[in-house]
């Protein structure tokens, strides 16, 4: 990482006494079963904990659950099981917490076999009180809140009915039958697929895609021959079966399904899949599976309409539909993504992009690390990051990579240093510049979390033995202090801190075991007295993101602009605080060819910034489908990268003409759509 401000580790003064005064133990009066924890609202301090325990009897399983509530970030808990009439709560539905700070919670109860419908418990006051409601259906899925209005809920029933409530679950109405999948879109719109003949599975590829914008009063069929659909950013995607064979193609809409365009992506066969890896309002990362059981595919990045795609990364590791991919959005720095590729020799290597998929490179070898046994050359190797795939393979990796938008530049991950990911026990590495440079932070696997917007990093060693020690760093992982939080070690099960990394509280969850019983226990540690003063201006330094060469005029330019951030100095031990807002200053860069992606019919040869015509399209008119009409494209091969803000400099010419012809290849052209009202 960037040269540290302090080579020597200064100890935080009197931290043991300060932390001891701020360590709160809570022993749960339960037998150990499963425990789930949810935060209710932002900065409210309200946590709900649901413990469940199954007792197998001779012919049935008897379940028991308890509900606890804290309103001080987990320091104290109150048993509120009586608020839900001591009912057994179904953990597979989890606790459905309302969006933003609505304070809404829905718990789905277990009901006896013969009942007419399910039962839910609803709270709209941050779980202070609950109302029991019997449902006219048995839910198949968790209640889904409309992102725009937390009073609007939707759920699918076990009979494939689509049910909607407009008054936060008080009253329910079945708005459609034979529904396979339903999702909220923007503006309280619901998208869903329906089957006509037998079932969702039988009709796969012959489903219809419907839309309602008025909670079921009226409907519009916006697609036919649908295999599946997905929403990402402002894009609606549908994979549609081809007329002639069993292949399917992606179609995309940016107007809620009124008009569709065929995405310039390869079609896929029965055994293959598409996957939206990431999407925002500018663009989408799409994975297209390779034919055969290869375990890899290709990442494509879209233009601003989601139609023209550029090949971004070959041999991208993605095991099966709904399987594992290591694709990770590094949220602490704009434009950065990390993923894994499966190389020809079947080893797995980590790749990183700093420009939203434009270029991928290996991760730079940490300065304080040696190349491991996987390296052919002991002086030349890279850092390889363990993510979802390693976790799924049961490697000794307790956590995926971690980054937080308000902890600018910080990325923490397990990794190994060599030519490929190693199955050996990994260490924990940190980057303070969004992935450009890395340092070994902790030896061996750990759980880790970020507090106070990066002001504190907390870690606990991953061990099969009981633990009683927590580690913390106030200088972005350079130096570590250890604190013994209990005399009696516990079997550790998880670290919990409020989402958003603004809190200064961390909860350590685990269980204690004695001769006959085991009990859940939590220790909540408040670090407020370690960071005893509020940060002042002198505690911050300015940092230019994406800086690789200070002498280069375009240093820091990514997607057409550079950003300078105020960041906490590593040597400052102070509180950013809950109200901390990232201070950044953008400045526009001149356009270069790097700010353009290759247009339809063009590609970039390796290590070249120029776009050249695809040989098979040379001399042909460039015609493609847009909104069900054929368009003629006049281009010199470039299209501005979505989200790129550059101005001046290079400016390639581009013109699109409407050929006033219908596309025969577009199955979702507007005249195939119809509307109806309830």
């Amino acid at each position: 990482s960037a040269p540290g401000e302090d080579e020597e580790c200064g100890r935080v003064r009197d931290f043991v006494a300060k932390l001891a005064n701020n360590t709160h133990q809570h022993v749960f009066d339960d037998l150990r079963g499963s425990v789930s924890l949810s935060w209710v609202g932002d900065s409210t301090g309200v946590i709900l904990v649901l413990t469940t325990f199954h007792v197998p009897l001779v012919i049935m399983t008897f379940g028991q659950s308890k509900l606890y509530r804290s309103e001080d970030y987990g320091k104290n808990f109150k048993d509120i099981t009586d608020l839900i009439n001591n009912t057994f709560i179904r953990t597979e539905f989890g606790m459905a917490i309302g969006p933003e700070n609505s304070g809404k919670v829905v718990l789905t109860a277990e009901v006896s076999g013969g009942s007419r419908g399910g039962r839910i418990f609803r709270s709209s006051d941050f779980a202070k009180n609950f109302v029991q409601t019997d449902l006219p259906f048995h839910p198949l899925t968790q209640m889904m809140y409309s992102p725009q209005n937390s009073d609007y809920l939707l759920a699918l029933s076990t009979e494939n009915g689509l049910w909607v409530s407009k008054n936060f679950g008080g009253k329910w109405e079945e708005i459609h039958k034979a529904v396979c999948l339903a999702k909220w879109g923007s503006d309280n719109t619901i998208f869903f697929t329906t089957y006509a003949n037998g079932s969702c599975k039988a009709d796969l590829g012959a489903l219809e895609l419907w839309r309602t914008s008025d909670l079921g009063k009226s409907f519009k069929t916006i697609g036919v021959k649908i295999y599946s659909f997905g929403l990402g950013g402002r894009f609606l995607f549908a994979s549609v079966m081809a007329d002639k064979d069993t292949t399917r193609r992606i179609h995309v809409s940016t107007d809620q399904g009124d008009t569709w365009s065929m995405a310039q992506l390869p079609s896929v066969g029965q055994e293959q899949f598409y996957s939206i890896l990431a999407a925002n309002d500018d663009m989408v990362f799409m994975h297209v599976d390779e034919p055969g059981d290869t375990g890899f595919g290709t990442i494509f990045t879209s233009d601003d309409r989601g139609i023209v795609y550029s090949k971004s990364l070959d041999r991208h590791l993605y095991t099966t539909t709904g399987g594992e991919t290591d694709f990770t959005n590094v949220t602490s720095l704009r434009g950065v993504y990390i993923t894994s590729v499966l190389s020809e020799d079947n080893s797995i290597q980590t790749m990183i992009t700093f420009d939203q998929g434009g270029r991928w490179t290996h991760l730079r070898k940490p300065e304080n690390s040696e190349c491991d046994a996987t390296a052919k050359n002991k002086n030349e190797c890279s850092l390889h990051i363990h993510a979802s795939y390693s976790i799924s393979q049961k490697l000794n990796v307790p956590m995926a990579p971690l980054s937080e938008p308000n902890a600018v530049g910080i990325v923490i991950a397990h990794g190994s240093v060599g030519d490929a990911i190693s199955v050996m026990v990994p260490d924990v590495y940190i980057s303070d510049d969004g992935g450009y440079s890395w340092t070994k932070m902790l030896e061996g696997p750990h759980y880790y979390t970020i507090l106070d917007s990066g002001g504190i990093i907390v870690a606990i060693e991953h061990s099969s033995r009981p633990i009683n020690v927590i580690k913390f760093s106030t200088d972005e992982g350079q130096c570590w202090q250890t604190y013994t939080f209990t005399r009696d070690p516990i079997y550790f099960t998880g670290l919990a801190s409020e989402p958003g990394a603004r809190s200064m509280n961390i909860s350590i969850w685990g269980f204690t075991e004695s001769f006959l019983t085991s009990q859940w226990v939590s220790y909540t540690i408040d670090f407020k007295d370690i960071l005893e003063r509020n940060c002042e201006e002198k505690d911050y330094t300015i940092w230019l993101a994406h800086s690789t060469d200070p002498e280069d005029y375009e240093d820091g330019c990514i997607l057409g602009y550079k950003e300078q951030f105020l960041r906490l100095r590593k040597s400052s031990v102070c509180q950013n605080g809950r109200d901390y807002v990232v201070t950044k200053q953008p400045s526009i860069c001149l356009c270069s060819l790097e700010d353009f992606l290759c247009d339809f019919g063009y590609y970039r040869p390796e290590n070249d910034s120029k776009c050249v015509e695809q040989p098979e399209l040379k001399g042909h008119d460039l015609e493609f489908c847009l909104y069900g009409r054929e368009e003629h494209l006049t281009t010199n091969g470039y299209r501005k990268i979505p989200g790129d803000k550059c101005q001046g400099g290079v400016n390639p010419v581009r013109e699109v003409k409407d050929l006033k012809k219908k596309c025969t290849s577009n199955f979702l052209s507007p005249e195939k759509q119809n509307s109806k009202s309830n």
């Epitope: 960037a2 040269p3 401000e5 302090d6 080579e7 510049d433 002198k538 330094t541 300015i542 940092w543 230019l544 993101a545 994406h546 800086s547 200070p550 002498e551 280069d552 005029y553 240093d555 820091g556 550079k562 300078q564 960041r567 040597s571 200053q585 400045s587």
Partner: antibody, heavy 124, light 106 residues
Framework: QVQLVQSGAEVKKPGSSVKVSCKAS????????ISWVRQAPGQGLEWMGG????????NYAQKFQGRVTITADESTSTAYMELSSLRSEDTAVYYC?????????????????WGQGTTVTVSS | DIQMTQSPSTLSASVGDRVTITCRAS??????LAWYQQKPGKAPKLLIY???SLESGVPSRFSGSGSGTEFTLTISSLQPDDFATYYC????????FGGGTKVEIK
């Protein structure tokens, strides 16, 4: 190689203001910090304040707070230092200097490029 | 603001001598210290940054050491071109300079 070229010598009356410019040529401007340092005749160096042009926010020494304004114009790669309410003890050579940078951080790596200096004389 | 005290204020030495200049900070500044050389009528020239890192192009006879509050600049073998005034400067927060040390011919 970067060069910092400062405006010419100034003679000012007490109570008036002076504005000294510092133009960068031959390298980047917006992503380096620029400091202003003065040196009275026969005296040592005194830091007045600094700015990172791309960031826009200036930082001033306590002694000059309220009397000095440091600005930067990225389009012309020029930094400015304006000192108001001049008095005779402000007679000095005023230097602009670029703060070195090895990484994205503006950690302190010393002032590696200096202007030639601008003599400001305050006399009635 | 942090005060920087440089000693001695004047130092007489001969060519070939080993010269040491000391700088003391009123509070810890970690390693945020730079050393400059200035000749009459000229702008200062950076010699050392971050207490001990030699700026490129500066002869290796110059070296810096120290951290916290005590720092030294050493010229291992004084050359005719080295007769000048030397300043230390801290940058932990706001920048302040030491009073200077004039190295003159004995």
């Amino acid at each position: 190689q970067v060069q910092l070229v400062q405006s010419g010598a100034e003679v000012k009356k007490p109570g008036s203001s002076v504005k000294v410019s510092c133009k960068a040529s031959g390298g980047t401007f917006s992503s380096y910090a620029i400091s202003w340092v003065r040196q009275a005749p026969g005296q040592g160096l005194e830091w007045m304040g600094g700015i990172i042009p791309g960031f826009g926010r200036a930082n001033y020494a306590q002694k000059f707070q309220g009397r000095v304004t440091i600005t930067a114009d990225e389009s012309t790669s020029t930094a400015y230092m304006e000192l108001s309410s001049l008095r005779s003890e402000d007679t000095a050579v005023y230097y602009c200097a670029r703060q070195g940078r090895k990484t994205g951080y503006y950690y302190y790596y010393g002032m590696d490029v200096w202007g030639q200096g601008t003599t400001v004389t305050v006399s009635s | 603001d942090i005060q920087m005290t440089q000693s001695p204020s004047t130092l007489s030495a001969s060519v070939g001598d080993r010269v040491t200049i000391t700088c003391r900070a009123s509070q810890s500044i970690s390693s945020w210290l730079a050393w400059y050389q200035q000749k009459p009528g000229k702008a200062p020239k950076l010699l050392i940054y971050k207490a001990s890192s030699l700026e490129s192009g500066v002869p290796s006879r110059f070296s810096g050491s120290g951290s916290g509050t005590e720092f030294t600049l050493t010229i291992s073998s004084l050359q005719p071109d080295d007769f000048a005034t030397y300043y230390c400067q801290q940058a932990d927060g706001h920048i302040t300079f030491g009073g200077g040390t004039k190295v003159e011919i004995k």
